[in-house]
């Protein structure tokens, strides 16, 4: 696990570009950015959703362009855009940065958004490295930014896949301890003997296979009956409550030629070393002429039986012979009970009612963990939640100052004035009412409900 961080340094007209400002809009506006991360550099990445994650920046300061004034340094949102990633950092990725302008003028239906620029870059980047700088052009615009990927302890390494522990810590098998706050020396786990059980074995030296309590055998596949009931297979004993060992499909390692065995429901699967394949890795002496690569894999090398061949697998397949389909859903990327769909070219999450987001990470119903700012209250209902904002505030979280006059509430040319407790309409001659909705007859009498005593047409009307 870790975090991808993006820092926008500047956005403005590029060299030779139109000398216009990104703020050239009617009325006040502000900039913000959105980032999308996709794994891989292939063309297939273009078809996949933002599988590594996405983030939306804060809005920048409100800016009103001064006519005839040169474009100033552009006020940008503060802070980093951070995209947390849960699994390994892929090393190669596609980065999409959208630059948006939010126009705060008198649009009907609220502020509009305008997409100013969209840059897409394919990059290689190791986690834990320094900031990488970039300058990208999109039409007449130029975007300057830096980015990095960093692991979050206890994960370390260029892909955030190694677990970190102090060198002084005792060796504790596969469940490595996280680093102490000031001790971040890390060791790559040694490569164990081929076939050593990932679940029940571990190693301190390369090539060895040491077993956890309750397991024995050269590859730690055989359960020990005298153990204290750790991870044993078989029916429960009535006398001890412990599991009585039963035979497992990998017992005795049915995989030949150094293949490693892993259990599947009711069966087993052999992962074969290069140069061997078959159910039990029993087939050898294969060359590229024998067509050993399945599912459209490209065979390289292996011109004679003594030299190994390598299968370069197409996206979606893996294994020494490209025989295994990558089950990207096995990583359970969809949160909150979402249904994972591996479409081949892309991964999709179909979210349960009340959840949304590329990975169903947004809980639309949850008021419990939801804070509405500025005195707003969270309201659930209709399969969604929303903030009911206090007067003078708006937006999804009531963080935005709302202009009560933005919706043009005063009818028939009435003028709207913002007031600390709402709004006031100053009606045009001939109209009255809280929103100037009632025409006044020439005799001074309203055609609809009578005005309260002492209120003359044209007087400002307080709107509660």
């Amino acid at each position: 696990a870790g975090v991808f961080e993006l820092q926008i340094h500047s956005f403005g007209p590029g060299p030779g570009g139109a000398p216009r400002s990104p703020y050239s809009a009617r009325g006040p506006c502000r900039l913000f950015f959105r980032v999308c991360l996709k794994p891989g550099l292939s063309e297939e990445a273009a078809e996949s959703p933002c599988a590594l994650g996405a983030a939306l920046s804060a809005r920048g300061p409100v800016y009103t362009e001064q006519p005839e004034a040169p474009a100033p340094d552009l006020p940008l949102p503060n802070g980093l855009l951070q995209v947390p990633f849960r699994d390994a950092w892929p090393g190669t990725f596609s980065l999409i940065i959208e630059t948006w302008r939010e126009e705060l003028g008198d649009q009907i239906g609220g502020p509009a958004w305008s997409l100013l620029a969209r840059v897409t870059r394919r990059r290689r980047l190791a986690a834990g490295g320094p900031w990488a700088g970039d300058i990208q052009r999109a039409g007449a615009w130029e975007l300057r930014f830096s980015y990095r990927a960093r692991c979050e302890l206890p994960a370390v390494g260029t892909a955030c896949t190694r677990l970190c522990r102090p060198r002084s810590a005792s060796r504790c098998g596969p469940g490595l301890r996280p680093c102490a706050p000031l001790e971040d020396e890390c060791e790559a786990p040694p490569v164990c003997r081929a076939g050593c059980s990932l679940e029940h074995g571990f190693c301190e030296q390369p090539g060895e296979c040491r077993c956890l309590e309750g397991w024995t055998g050269p590859l730690c596949m055989v359960p020990v009956s005298t153990s204290s009931c750790l991870g044993l297979r078989g029916p429960s004993s009535t006398t001890t409550g412990c599991l009585v060992p039963g035979p497992g499909p990998c017992d005795g390692n049915p995989c030949a030629n150094g293949g490693s065995c892993s259990e599947t429901p009711g069966s087993f699967e052999c992962t074969c070393p290069r140069g061997f394949y078959g159910l039990r890795c029993e087939v050898s002496g294969v060359t590229c002429a024998d067509g050993p690569c399945f599912n459209g894999g490209l065979c390289v090398g292996g011109a004679d039986p003594d030299s190994a061949y390598i299968c370069h697998c197409p996206p979606g397949f893996q294994g020494s012979n490209c025989e295994k389909r990558v089950d990207r859903c096995s990583l359970q990327p969809c949160r909150n009970g979402g249904l994972c769909l591996d479409l081949g070219h892309a991964l999709r999450c179909r979210c349960r009612a009340g959840f949304a987001g590329p990975r169903c990470e947004h809980d639309l119903n949850d008021c419990a963990g939801r804070a509405c700012a500025n005195g707003g209250t969270c309201v659930e209902g209709g399969g969604a939640h929303r903030c009911s904002c206090a007067l003078g505030f708006g937006g999804r979280d009531c963080r935005e100052r709302a202009d009560p006059c933005a919706a043009r509430p005063c009818a028939h040319g009435g003028r709207c004035y913002a007031h600390f407790s709402g709004l006031v309409c100053a009606c045009a001659p001939g109209y009255m009412g809280a929103r100037c909705e009632f025409p006044v007859h020439p005799d001074g009498v309203s055609a609809l409900p009578a005005a309260p005593p002492g209120l003359r047409p044209g007087d400002p009307q307080r709107y509660p």
Epitope: C36, E47, P49, C50, W100, G109, L115, R348, A356
Partner: nanobody, 127 residues
């Protein structure tokens, strides 16, 4: 499952207008961002604009601002693209797309983020 059908395309002279419709069948369209992309021959599919899922706000690409407007009629499960002051470089196949994501902010400008697509309608601007 949501099915999208575009209509309203055709041949128009420069400076003319067209109104495209995107009719959605299936689930309630109001829960979805409904947006328009366009694709000219030999070009990548380009975001034009549309309305967001969570509050219906309009989003535009800068090049069409002031000429194109986006609206939706949730009662009819239909989105609209009103195109005025058309130019020859607006010639393309226009596609309607919909998705529940993102749950906040403007709609995605990236085609791969949309689960549901129409088959497109041709717009040709030529004298």
């Amino acid at each position: 499952e949501v099915d999208l059908v575009e209509s309203g395309g055709g041949l128009v002279q420069p400076g003319g207008s067209l109104r495209l419709s995107c009719a959605a069948s299936g689930r309630t369209a109001s829960r979805y961002s409904m947006v328009w992309f366009r694709q000219a021959p030999g070009q990548e599919r380009e975001f034009v604009g549309g309305n967001s899922a969570h509050d219906g706000r309009s989003a535009y690409t800068d090049s069409v601002k002031g000429r194109f407007t986006f609206s939706r009629d949730n009662a009819k499960n239909t989105g609209y693209l009103q195109m005025n002051s058309l130019r020859p470089d607006d010639t393309a196949v226009y596609y309607c797309a919909a998705d529940t994501n993102p749950p906040y902010g403007p709609p995605w400008s990236t085609p791969s983020e949309y689960e549901y697509w129409g088959h497109g309608t041709q717009v040709t601007v030529s004298s």
